[in-house]
């Protein structure tokens, strides 16, 4: 299978988390516990 071509495991999981778990109907931006730039988005 094709694999990710990203530099870090954090980036891999960050992008996948946003892909699958961002709540498009919410103003939160993403699910609770998603870290962006070291800040946890609530």
């Amino acid at each position: 299978d094709a694999e990710f071509r990203h530099d870090s495991g954090y980036e891999v999981h960050h992008q996948k988390l946003v892909f699958f778990a961002e709540d498009v109907g919410s103003n939160k931006g993403a699910i609770i516990g998603l870290m962006v730039g070291g800040v946890v988005i609530a």
Epitope: F4, H6, Q15, V18, F20, A21
Partner: antibody
Framework: QVQLKESGPGLVAPSQSLSITCTVS????????VSWIRQPPGKGLEWLGV???????NYHSALISRLSISKDNSKSQVFLKLNSLQTDDTATYYC??????WGQGIPVTVSA | DVVLTQTPLTLSVTIGQPASISCKSS???????????LIWLLQRPGQSPKRLIY???TLDSGVPDRFTGSGSGTDFTLKISRVEAEDLGVYYC?????????FGGGTKLEIK
């Protein structure tokens, strides 16, 4: 408001290439992954591939030799190219922003 | 590839009654980041699929709380506590833990 719209030919001849454009609005392609998914008539969903915010890609292993996904961030467009089409590539093709926002889909028939 | 097996294929339910759909995976969907990338979609007739639930059990905004998702590892369930007319369509599970991302075959919910 997030929107995605697929455009391209509705009919393609066997052995030819399919090119579909997904034009998006309401978000930046630099920040989000966009995926392509297809659905043959009366059947289920099949994931084709994804292009990430940084431009890297992942493809379905069964299609990796025929499939290419690219994008133009400045035009807010994502492109799918599928080569060597066969009749079983007949399907409605969807682009998605993540898993939560889907385009309306574009029906593509592969026929002589 | 990960195979997602949905049962039943068709579900005929009286309005107001409960419904349950199973999605079983050929391998564990627990990712190395500790999350389980299993989502549920509903495709109403003539429409694009719509995500209902992500990360096994989290409801999308606007999705009625009569829907619940549960499970872990290889066994997952979507339950509707009281079916309404707007719930008819085809339900799909979708895993994003392992490449290639794969879908279940779908469960058609019919209203009696």
């Amino acid at each position: 408001q997030v929107q995605l719209k697929e455009s391209g030919p509705g009919l393609v001849a066997p052995s030819q290439s399919l090119s579909i454009t997904c034009t998006v609005s309401g978000f930046s392609l630099t920040n989000y992954g966009v995926s392509w998914i297809r659905q043959p008539p009366g059947k289920g969903l099949e994931w084709l591939g994804v292009i990430w915010g940084d431009g890297s890609t992942n493809y379905h292993s069964a299609l990796i030799s025929r499939l290419s996904i690219s994008k133009d961030n400045s035009k807010s467009q994502v492109f799918l190219k599928l080569n060597s089409l066969q009749t079983d590539d007949t399907a409605t093709y969807y682009c998605t922003k993540g898993a939560g926002s889907w385009g309306q889909g574009i029906p593509v028939t592969v026929s002589a | 590839d990960v195979v997602l097996t949905q049962t039943p294929l068709t579900l005929s339910v009286t309005i107001g009654q409960p419904a349950s759909i199973s999605c079983k995976s050929s391998q564990s969907l627990l990712d190395s980041d500790g999350r389980t990338y299993l989502i549920w979609l509903l495709q109403r007739p003539g429409q694009s699929p719509k995500r209902l639930i992500y990360l096994v059990s989290t409801l999308d905004s606007g999705v009625p709380d009569r829907f619940t998702g549960s499970g872990s590892g290889t066994d997952f369930t979507l339950k509707i506590s009281r079916v309404e007319a707007e719930d008819l369509g085809v339900y799909y599970c979708w895993q994003g833990t392992h490449f290639p991302w794969t879908f279940g075959g779908g469960t058609k919910l019919e209203i009696k």
